[in-house]
């Protein structure tokens, strides 16, 4: 329970906080425990204890072992282990699994990525982030204290993010990175009744006879993906396939558009070479989903060709 | 009892047609989106088609579009498949299912078969 | 099209065992998965729906949990009546997408 596994590359620093918390006061001594050699306080070894804090500045991989930290007060020790191991650098981007702190999930409505144990470190901004080894760069990243502010999330946003530090101890600098995996959450959308936004109910549509006239039912349905969702044309509450008129047809497929941030569709009713007889028809267009069927009829009526004569 | 029940199963050549129904009872037919989920034999089940409640809206899997067609009659309580062009992978129990709370398949028919051999 | 993975592929196990099994979504569903049972020669049987709320009259050893892609159903006391193949399914977004199964049987 009081033990604690940290990690780091070698020529990096790293820090480790004791597992066993007490106050300020008490006296907290490290030791090693395969040797239980004392580590020693002066600042000047590279591998040195400073209260609650087992620095290492900078880490090699010899360093990896287990560490006993006694925290001492006047009527109780609490004995904690840091199980620390410090890696070689590796040569390619890749991190490996052992090199990840824990994953987090954004969406669009947070998308703070926080640099893990950058607390324990005595940094100075700015903090460096990168995305699959790659520098971030653009207007929608903003590096703001010890956390990465992603602008307008998209699930290609999710990988692995790296941040990286300047670690100061008395005047000297040591290089720090931690890496952690971010996922993108689809924020979770919801369906509606459908809402037709065209045509309006009961429209009357000028069309000429003899040409083409297009006709647009569109609806919405709620936000982010849609289960089950559709729009269609019916002719006198029949379905356009089974109405039998190869002059009337309904586009293939429905095309999904966003509006205000819902989720919509539309479908185009062609009417080609227009005749007279198609003026007797109802249309109807038809938006469903599991919530229910809303319906907006349509008529068609001519449109007076325009009087060229004075 | 609310149940499913299909029918119309059988052995057909590479390339014909077979039709499937599925009689309903039980409950409010018409209240409910429709579906057929196959299974192959040996292998997992594969959601095949689906209709809406008045069967003005229908949604079909890829491997199937525009060779089966489901379709409703609801004054018969009974849902149907017509398959056209069988090829050898169609083989498989199919079976129909009501689609109820939370989008889930909670009723199922016991299953027809149709196989499709030369 | 969302492809749903389950692991493991198989397993077996005794009967008071805890079994757990887990399916993953290629993208993120909500909470718009559900867990089947199918036994031999027999239609698949709704155990749990919307991620982890129990079927009417299925038994509470059952549960489920999990949301976005990761998603879990556990057996918390197998009985001899629970070997079967059991299978998760999407309603996120069409085309409906299954796994491809976890068949638990006897040790």
């Known amino acids: 329970k009081f033990s604690k596994q940290s990690w780091g590359l070698e020529n990096e620093a790293l820090i480790v906080r004791c597992p066993r918390q007490g106050k300020p006061s008490y006296t907290v001594d490290w030791y090693y425990s395969q040797t239980n050699k004392s580590i020693p306080t002066q600042e000047r070894n590279r591998v040195f204890a400073s209260g609650q804090l087992l620095k290492f500045l900078p880490a090699a991989v010899a360093d990896s072992g287990i560490y006993t930290c006694i925290v001492r007060s006047p009527t109780f020790n609490r004995t904690g282990y840091a199980n620390v191991t410090i890696y070689k650098k590796q040569s390619d981007c890749n991190v490996p699994d052992y090199l990840m702190y824990s994953t987090v999930s954004g969406s669009e409505k947070n998308s703070k990525i926080y640099c893990p144990t950058i607390d324990l470190y005595n940094w100075t901004a700015p903090l460096e982030w990168f995305k699959n080894c790659q520098a971030l760069q653009g207007s929608r990243y903003r590096a703001h204290k010890s956390f990465l502010v992603i602008d307008n999330v998209m699930t290609e946003d999710a990988g692995d993010y790296t941040c990286k530090f300047i670690h100061n101890e008395n005047g000297a600098n040591y290089s720090v990175t931690a890496t952690r995996s971010f996922t993108v959450k689809d924020e979770q959308g919801f369906s509606l009744f459908p809402v037709i936004g065209a045509p309006a109910q009961n429209e009357i549509k000028e069309v000429e006879i003899g040409k083409n006239a297009n006709l647009t039912c569109s609806a919405c349905f709620g936000k982010g993906t849609q289960f089950l969702a559709a729009v269609l044309w019916q002719l006198n509450g029949t379905k356009i396939t089974d109405f039998g008129e190869p002059r009337i047809q309904q586009e293939e497929g429905q095309n999904q558009s966003f509006s205000n941030g819902l989720a919509c569709l539309d479908m185009v009713l062609r009417i080609a070479d227009v005749k007279e007889e198609d003026l007797l028809l109802q249309y109807d267009c038809l938006a469903l989903n599991l919530h229910g069927l809303r319906r907006h009829t349509v008529r068609l009526s001519r449109k007076n060709p325009i009087d060229h004569h004075s | 009892e609310v149940q499913l029940l299909e029918s119309g199963g059988g052995l057909v050549q590479p390339g014909g047609s077979l039709r499937l129904s599925c009689a309903a009872s039980?409950?409010?037919?018409?209240?409910?989106?429709m579906n057929w989920v196959r299974q192959a034999p040996g292998k997992g089940l594969e959601w095949v088609s689906t209709?809406?409640?008045?069967?003005?809206?229908?949604f079909y899997a890829d491997s199937v579009k525009g060779r089966f067609t489901i379709s409703r009659d609801n004054s018969k309580n009974t849902l149907y498949l017509q398959m056209n062009s069988l090829r050898a992978e169609d083989t498989a129990v199919y079976y129909c299912?009501?689609?109820?709370?939370?989008?889930?398949?909670?009723?199922w028919g016991q299953g027809t078969t149709v196989t499709v051999s030369s | 099209d969302i492809q749903m993975t389950q692991s493991p592929s198989s397993l077996s196990a005794s009967v008071g065992d805890r079994v757990t099994i887990t399916c993953r979504a290629s993208q993120s569903i909500g909470s718009w998965m559900a867990w089947y049972q199918q036994k031999p020669g027999k239609a698949p049987k709704l155990l749990i729906y919307?991620?982890?709320t129990l079927q009417s009259g299925v038994p509470s050893r059952f549960s489920g949990s999990g949301s976005g892609t990761d998603f879990t159903l556990t057996i918390s006391s197998l009985q001899p009546e629970d070997f079967a193949t059991y299978y998760c399914?999407?309603?996120?977004?069409?085309?409906?997408?299954f796994g491809p199964g976890t068949k638990v049987d006897i040790k």
């Open positions: 399914q999407q309603s996120y977004t069409t085309p409906i997408t």
């Open positions: 209709i809406s409640g008045f069967g003005e809206s229908t």
């Open positions: 919307a991620a982890s």
């Open positions: 299912a009501r689609l109820g709370a939370a989008r889930a398949f909670d009723i």
């Open positions: 039980g409950f409010t037919f018409s209240d409910y989106y």
